[in-house]
């Protein structure tokens, strides 16, 4: 890949092994765990990153209330099955033949079942709400400065088209970033909001996926923005299917 050409590394994904074994001796970077060649000029899909991770070691209230159908990733890490495009397979199973259906960001959207469980399609997560709490500061950040800085971050660092950053809400100390991307809106070459959100989440945790870059240094008008808590809600184009038992628990 041209992005990796000079010294055969992958700027956008440190969870790769790069080798001059591509066509014509060109540099080629393969994701750990899956062995799939990745495009180092853009973000790597969350599925391949998770697989690699498992193989390596204003006064008005503006905050959004997540809908009743919003999913939070409570299951944590697992070794996912990715399709040949690097996307999550709709059905995921563990080593003990327990299976479940996931959405396009790999979050479980059904009760767990056995090998007979059917997941007919990969349901797209079209709305992601990133809920952040920042550490105490001398005063509140200016909302429009904060908005501009976060939009710039998603555009420049994660290469996400600005139209997919739907809104930035702020009510000190809570910041909410809304990402929206319908199937029909996503063109070839567009970064997926799920991938951008995952890179952002890892950056916030101090676990940057970028090769050799310093960690995320978020500043608003020179003032450091330090995040102490992150919650991410995922909304799918089709609501999840959980049993009443779980919903009432």
């Amino acid at each position: 890949h041209t992005a990796a050409q000079d010294n055969c590394t992958c700027p956008t994904n440190k969870m790769t092994v790069c080798s001059p074994d591509g066509p014509g001796g060109r540099c080629q970077c393969r994701a750990l765990g899956s062995g799939m060649a990745v495009d180092c000029s853009t973000l790597t899909s969350k599925c391949l990153l998770l697989k690699a991770r498992m193989s390596a070691p204003k006064n008005a209230r503006t905050l959004v209330r997540p809908s009743e159908h919003a999913l939070v990733d409570n299951d944590g890490l697992y070794d996912p099955d990715c399709d040949p495009e690097g996307r999550f397979k709709a059905r995921q199973c563990n080593q003990t033949s327990v299976c479940w259906c996931v959405n396009s960001v790999g979050v479980r959207r059904t009760d767990k079942g056995d090998l007979s469980l059917r997941c007919d399609e990969l349901v797209r997560t079209h709305h992601i709400l990133i809920d952040l709490r920042h550490r105490p500061t001398a005063g509140a950040f200016n909302h429009s400065d904060l908005d501009a800085e976060l939009r710039r971050l998603f555009r420049e660092r994660y290469r996400l088209h600005p139209k997919f950053v739907a809104a930035v809400h702020y009510e000190q100390p809570t910041i909410q970033i809304e990402l929206r991307q319908n199937t029909s809106q996503k063109a070839a070459g567009d970064v997926d909001i799920g991938d951008a959100a995952y890179y952002f989440e890892r950056d916030i945790k101090g676990e940057s996926l970028f090769q050799g870059r310093g960690g995320l240094d978020l500043r608003v008008r020179g003032e450091p923005l330090q995040v102490e808590r992150t919650l991410i809600y995922y909304l799918d184009e089709i609501p999840p299917k959980f049993s009443m038992k779980r919903l009432t628990a």
Partner: antibody, heavy 116, light 113 residues
Framework: QVQLVQSGPEVKKPGASVKVSCKAS????????LGWVKQAPGQGLEWIGN????????NYNEKFKGRVTITADTSTSTAYMELSSLRSEDTAVYFC?????????WGQGTLVTVSS | DIVMTQSPDSLAVSAGERVTMNCKSS????????????LAWYQQKPGQPPKLLIY???TRESGVPDRFSGSGSGTDFTLTISSVQAEDVAVYYC?????????FGQGTKLEIK
């Protein structure tokens, strides 16, 4: 020129282990994936796994996991494939190969015979 | 795992004839990131290691005669020998190196009538 030279034939008893070596020359050993492939008598080819010697990343085919160990010694540019708890169906020719889109380099093969 | 299925299992042709053999994969081998198909064709003669003929579905390895050509994309691939020679008698394997574990087809045996 690129060369992969494998160790000689082995005859082993069931339950024993065998370690096949593959010495690489003519290229930078640490920056290419090196894979191992099994070919049982009269049968097709089966990918066992691979290693990236520069960082010792290793991948195994689930079918062989637990019984096979792939290692590399960068000081001698040699890769190894060790197979344990041998059984008759492990009788095969084992090849090492430099992997990659245009890496058509294979060792000559090592015949491992498992017989009581 | 990706399953590679080759057809036919064997074929016998006269020298000079054109031959095609097929390889079908259970999943696409096209990498959307670089638009490369991760499929290779190998020729294996008795007592020898496989010899790489084609990589990337259609790129001929250097030193391979131009009578050998590869085509196809996604899940369906073809190896063509435009004019078979006596030295082409061998078993031909297709291989996916798109995603672990890499897998091979069962092989197509080519004989001369």
């Amino acid at each position: 020129q690129v060369q992969l030279v494998q160790s000689g034939p082995e005859v082993k008893k069931p339950g024993a282990s065998v370690k096949v070596s593959c010495k690489a020359s003519g290229y930078t050993f640490t920056i290419y994936w090196l894979g191992w492939v099994k070919q049982a008598p009269g049968q097709g080819l089966e990918w066992i796994g691979n290693i990236f010697p520069g960082s010792a990343y290793i991948n195994y085919n689930e079918k062989f996991k637990g019984r096979v160990t792939i290692t590399a010694d960068t000081s001698t540019s040699t890769a190894y494939m060790e197979l344990s708890s041998l059984r008759s169906e492990d009788t095969a020719v084992y090849f090492c190969a430099r992997e990659g889109s245009n890496s058509g380099y294979w060792g000559q093969g090592t015949l491992v015979t498992v017989s009581s | 795992d990706i399953v590679m299925t080759q057809s036919p299992d064997s074929l016998a042709v006269s020298a000079g004839e054109r031959v095609t053999m097929n390889c079908k994969s259970s999943q696409s081998l096209l990498n959307s990131g670089n638009q490369q198909n991760y499929l290779a064709w190998y020729q294996q003669k008795p007592g020898q290691p496989p010899k790489l003929l084609i990589y990337g579905a259609s790129t001929r390895e250097s030193g391979v005669p131009d009578r050998f050509s590869g085509s196809g994309s996604g899940t369906d691939f073809t190896l063509t020998i435009s004019s078979v020679q006596a030295e082409d008698v061998a078993v031909y394997y297709c291989q996916s190196d798109h995603i672990y574990p890499y897998t091979f087809g069962q092989g197509t045996k080519l004989e001369i009538k």
